[in-house]
């Protein structure tokens, strides 16, 4: 059977190492059946998640899944932190797992680390 609940597929323990000054698109994967749900992004601040009202977002539709994208153009140092997407569906609020952005400020780094370095050596983010 095909479930017609809305599903948000951000992965548990999801994280992305990105560079300040670069563009970045943060994906919220969404599965739905007939009507596309209203999806929003928020940024975690302690135990509350602050809704991101004025940020550029867009939908990307693929064959088996859709993406609600939060655009960073460009990434700023204070974009560092954890984000969550949520969907309103039939009066229910569905929340995703959180996803964490680790932002390296290239101005403060002695050299620009590669994506591979950032993926395999997370301590580069804090030097």
């Amino acid at each position: 059977k095909e479930s017609c609940d809305v599903q948000l597929y951000i992965k548990r323990q999801s994280e992305h190492s990105i560079l300040a000054g670069d563009p970045f698109e943060l994906e919220c994967p969404v599965k739905y059946c007939a009507n596309r749900p209203h999806v929003t992004w928020c940024k975690l601040n302690g135990t509350t998640c602050v809704k991101l009202e004025d940020r550029q977002t867009s939908w990307k539709e693929e064959k088996n899944i859709s993406f609600f994208i939060l655009h960073f153009e460009p990434v700023l140092p204070n974009d560092n932190g954890s984000y969550r997407c949520s969907a309103n569906f039939q009066s229910n609020l569905i929340e995703s797992h959180s996803t964490t952005l680790y932002v390296t400020d290239v101005k403060s780094a002695s050299e620009r680390p590669s994506k591979d370095e950032m993926a395999s050596r997370p301590w580069l983010l804090y030097r």
Epitope: K11, R12, S17, I18, F24, K31, K60, M118, A119
Partner: antibody, heavy 116, light 107 residues
Framework: QVQLQESGPGLVKPSETLSLTCTVS????????WTWIRQPPGKGLEWIGH???????HYNPSLKSRFTISADTSKNRFSLKLSSVTAADTAVYYC??????????WGQGTTVTVSS | AIQLTQSPSSLSASVGDRVTITCRAS??????VAWYQQNPGKAPKLLIY???SLESGVSSRFSGSGSGTDFTLTISSLQPEDFATYYC?????????FGQGTKLEIK
């Protein structure tokens, strides 16, 4: 329609480094997660690890730290490196797309034999 | 790591039979289970995701159920092309482990 194609040497000598590439056509690796799985002869499937659209990686800790997954967005492909191979690394290696809910697209697999 | 134990490891059945394969997780994994079919010399093929959702293009004789630690794959009426090996996989926690497989053979 997204298609995946593995490539690499069929035969590797013990202690050498194995390099495999998965070329993605019909879609971009700038979305989704991209996975490597292996299957030793006559045995089950083993999840090696994956790389995300941003370049972040997760690996199977039971496989020690000999694996490295990387991606080349300009060539729309991702790669697996395995250092210090032994006979126990003989397997069919598959690349697959993690469509977030499951591994929904697979390559046909490439057989790797470790032998001197 | 989360362990997935499939039972039975092998199963003999006839065309037209109803068959059930089970997958038990070592801890609660909600509904984050997928089922795959693998024929000899071929790559696995996705059948079921989220424990009970049928992948597009897959025959409706395949169905999945379960949540928490116990999951089942059912084939309602076996066809000749269904004789293969079946694997469950969990997506709840890293690493994304597979069950050891269930080989379905013709009786």
């Amino acid at each position: 329609q997204v298609q995946l194609q593995e490539s690499g040497p069929g035969l590797v000598k013990p202690s050498e480094t194995l390099s495999l590439t998965c070329t993605v056509s019909g879609g971009s690796i700038s979305s989704y997660y991209w996975t490597w799985i292996r299957q030793p002869p006559g045995k089950g499937l083993e999840w090696i690890g994956h790389i995300s659209y941003s370049g972040s990686t997760h690996y199977n800790p039971s496989l020690k730290s000999r694996f490295t997954i990387s991606a080349d967005t300009s060539k729309n492909r991702f790669s697996l490196k395995l250092s210090s191979v032994t006979a126990a690394d003989t397997a069919v290696y598959y690349c697959a797309r993690d469509g977030y809910y499951a591994l929904d697209v697979w390559g046909q697999g490439t057989t790797v034999t470790v032998s001197s | 790591a989360i362990q997935l134990t499939q039972s039975p490891s092998s199963l003999s059945a006839s065309v037209g039979d109803r068959v059930t394969i089970t997958c038990r997780a070592s801890q609660d994994i909600s509904n984050t289970v997928a089922w795959y079919q693998q024929n000899p010399g071929k790559a696995p093929k996705l059948l079921i995701y989220d424990a009970s959702s049928l992948e597009s293009g897959v025959s409706s004789r395949f169905s999945g159920s379960g949540s928490g630690t116990d999951f089942t794959l059912t084939i309602s009426s076996l066809q000749p092309e269904d004789f293969a090996t079946y694997y469950c996989q969990q997506f709840n926690n890293y690493p994304y482990t597979f069950g050891q497989g269930t080989k379905l053979e013709i009786k």
